[in-house]
């Protein structure tokens, strides 16, 4: 807290300019009018203030706006944003995408800080949903943003926003998140033709149910092994040998290298060995001919 001292004669700031960098902290406090600072916030960023000086400027704004800064000030905070606490940000009402972009730019190249997370949360809650433009902006700055949301939060993403999602944005999503995103993607891309549809839906297939995988197997999609390995195990188990062969196309040979890993391993364990043999890949671990799984209660639980 800076002591209240009178401004020395002739030092009263008429505008926010470079001369202020020579002011001591108490002089900034005494000689810079908070209202002037608020109207000329856009200049602060261009002036190489020290962290201590920025603390004083923040303090002045806090005094002027105890209920939270107006958006006209927030949009021009620049590096002063880094001085804000999540508690400060929770008082804000940010509605403009331009404001959001300006503040994300300040933090660019760094991990998502608690301040940024709070800002985004306030912004999205204010909008009521994660619209396409917002998602575009957020994933541009933070490719992992989508996967940082809970399934509940993801449920507010409208299908139209899915067009903004790039494959790399889903890299760190877990199956529960993809379970929420997949039906939205399916809806978003439903009017595309076969091959185009598969290109778009591929990244989301970790949330696809069996019925959709069976349908895809009839469309000559040639799914790569990396995508196949990310499918839900419970969705893969009901696929027949023929369907897996059709789904993977020329990539079916890759099953051999993955036969000890899920979901391939679990799928193999449920196939008849002589069915697996028709693939000619040397896959081992299927159910020997003549054997039958009789414990139906157990397999019901598994399926």
């Amino acid at each position: 807290e800076v002591e209240k001292t009178a401004c020395p004669s002739g030092k009263k700031a008429r505008e926010i300019d470079e001369s202020l960098i020579f002011y001591k902290k108490w002089e900034l406090e005494a000689c810079v009018d908070a209202a002037l600072l608020a109207t000329q916030m856009d200049r602060v960023n261009a002036i190489p203030f020290t962290y201590e000086q920025l603390d004083v400027l923040k303090h002045k704004l806090d005094e002027l706006y105890p209920q939270g800064y107006p958006e006209s000030v927030i949009q021009h905070l620049g590096y002063l944003f880094l001085k804000m606490s999540p508690e400060d940000i929770r008082k804000w009402n940010v509605t403009s995408l331009e404001t959001l972009k300006a503040l994300l730019e300040v933090n660019k190249g760094h991990e998502m800080s608690p301040q940024v997370a709070t800002l985004i949360d306030r912004f999205v809650k204010g909008r009521g949903q994660l619209d396409k433009d917002t998602l575009d902006t957020l994933t541009a700055f933070y490719p992992g943003y989508l996967c940082s949301l809970s399934p509940e939060e993801l449920s507010s993403v409208p299908p139209s926003s899915i067009w903004a999602v790039r494959p790399q944005d889903l890299d760190t999503c877990d199956p529960r998140q993809l379970d929420v995103l997949y039906p939205k993607a399916r809806l978003a891309f439903q009017n595309m033709n076969g091959s185009e549809y598969f290109v778009k839906i591929q990244s989301f297939l970790g949330g696809a149910p069996t019925e959709d995988l069976k349908a895809l197997s009839q469309q000559n999609v040639s799914m790569d092994l990396a995508t196949f390995m990310k499918l839900r195990t419970d969705a893969v188990l009901p696929l027949t040998v023929a369907e897996v062969q059709k789904l993977l196309g020329p990539h079916v040979e890759g099953l051999k290298a993955e036969e000890r890993h899920r979901p391939v391993r679990d799928w193999i364990l449920r196939q008849r060995q002589d069915d697996l043999d028709t693939l000619g890949l040397g896959l081992q671990g299927g159910i020997p001919n003549g054997y039958l799984v009789l414990d139906l209660s157990m397999q019901e639980a598994l399926s």
């Epitope: 009901p238 027949t240 009789l294």
Partner: nanobody, 115 residues
């Protein structure tokens, strides 16, 4: 030659039940996985349920708890018991036999659920 013949379809009211049968001939039934598919007017054919030759059963999400697939290897027949039927279950129901890369289809039986 392989033949699959479905029966048991018909008109039923919402909430009603039907039991479909699919009798197979010309194949060693026990080593084939058996599945039910359906196709509604103007839509693509979609998978409903499977009963593998090794005893596993699977269902599409929308029919779980309402439909039950079973098989009788001695009679070379697979069944689909459909309860709590809904208008959206209206479709032609097909059975399919699969083994390795071989697949055989039946001609289908119409199921209509009226509201």
């Amino acid at each position: 030659q392989v033949q699959l013949v479905e029966s048991g379809g018909g008109l039923v009211q919402t909430g009603g039940s039907l039991r479909l049968s699919c009798a197979a001939s010309g194949l060693t039934f026990g080593v084939y996985g058996m599945e039910w598919f359906r196709q509604a007017p103007g839509k693509q054919r979609e998978w409903v349920a499977s009963h593998t030759s090794t005893g596993y059963v699977y269902y599409r999400d929308s029919v779980k708890g309402r439909f039950t697939i079973s098989r009788d290897n001695a009679k070379s027949t697979v069944y689909l018991q459909m309860n709590s039927l809904k208008p959206e279950d209206t479709a032609i129901y097909y059975c399919k036999a699969n083994r390795g890369s071989y697949e055989y289809w039946g001609q289908g039986t119409q199921v209509t659920v009226s509201s």
